[in-house]
Interface confidence: low
Amino acid sequence: RTVPPMVNVTCSEVSEGNITVTCRASSFYPRNITLTWRQDGVSLSHNTQQWGDVLPDGNGTYQTWVATRIRQGEEQRFTCYMEHSGNHGTHPVSGKVLVLQSHW
């Protein structure tokens, strides 16, 4: 069986002028997934991104996330790219900044 992920992008302020953008994929199966951030269409180096573990979400499906830190005002340059079981999608940053605890 294949259950495609639901993908959600959020922003959190970490310091003046900087934000962390987090791309969360949830409710997907099987567990193999690719999530990566792109800037102007080019994949960011892996040392500039942080990944969460792929974890079961209790419903027989999985969840994970990837985050990166960017300059506020440059959100439109960044997209989250997802690949899962032959499907792919690109998800832009909304630009809405939430006050959340950072992953960094």
Partner: antibody
Framework: QVQLQESGPGLVKPSETLSLTCTVS????????GHWIRQPPGKGLEWIGM???????DYNAAFISRVTISVDTSKNQFSLKLSSVTAADTAVYYC?????????????WGQGTLVTVSS | EIVLTQSPGTLSLSPGERATLSCTAS???????LHWYQQKPGQAPRLLIY???NLISGIPDRFSGSGSGTDFTLTISRLEPEDFAVYYC?????????FGQGTKLEIK
């Protein structure tokens, strides 16, 4: 059965453009990305670049001024073009599939094609 | 760029023995992005282990991988004649995505 097959000229003149095509079967390039890697005779492996399933490319910075990777999903092919070649570009060139969930590892490879740069 | 140094360059062992191959990175590599390949003469490389320790389907369980940070290891618990080949580690942590120079495993 997953297969990849490189094709193209085995001899290229210095300063010209090396052009190779990777024809795949057993999977679709709309669902798997592809890599190009090369191996000079008697030496190790060098990653050239990759193409994602949506057509975006990532290149080794060492080649970025002269490399182009493209895809033709209708023919199940992706291609490598390397311009301004020199003798240092003589190598076996491999195409490989980007595995799902294998964190960009190359899970299937073509058998490789030797390209010699010589006048 | 991240330089991967493999040691030893050549390892001479007999069938049935244990092989330990080392891969040292010049800077830290996420374990998710460290892979191992096997290459036999005249053949393309094949993926053995991805993300440091995950065995590809169909690869015998005498192969195993471990490590973190800058030090990674490929172990073959009991060598079979078909295991004698060149082994490469590969990192996709930071561009350019480099390979080690290889360890040649030869029959003693």
């Amino acid at each position: 059965q997953v297969q990849l097959q490189e094709s193209g000229p085995g001899l290229v003149k210095p300063s010209e453009t090396l052009s190779l095509t990777c024809t795949v079967s057993g999977f679709s390039l709309t669902t798997y990305g592809g890599h190009w890697i090369r191996q000079p005779p008697g030496k190790g492996l060098e990653w050239i670049g990759m193409i994602w399933t949506d057509g975006w490319t990532d290149y080794n910075a060492a080649f970025i001024s002269r490399v182009t990777i493209s895809v033709d999903t209708s023919k199940n092919q992706f291609s490598l073009k390397l311009s301004s070649v020199t003798a240092a570009d003589t190598a076996v060139y491999y195409c490989a599939r980007k595995g799902h969930g294998y964190y960009y590892a190359m899970d299937y490879w073509g058998q490789g094609t030797l390209v010699t740069v010589s006048s | 760029e991240i330089v991967l140094t493999q040691s030893p360059g050549t390892l001479s062992l007999s069938p049935g023995e244990r092989a330990t191959l080392s891969c040292t990175a010049s800077s830290s590599v996420s374990s998710s992005y460290l892979h191992w390949y096997q290459q036999k003469p005249g053949q393309a490389p094949r993926l053995l282990i991805y993300s440091t320790s995950n065995l590809i389907s169909g690869i015998p369980d005498r192969f195993s991988g471990s490590g973190s940070g800058t030090d990674f290891t490929l172990t073959i618990s009991r060598l079979e004649p078909e295991d004698f080949a060149v082994y490469y580690c590969h990192q996709y942590h930071r561009s350019p995505f480099t390979f080690g120079q290889g360890t040649k495993l030869e029959i003693k």
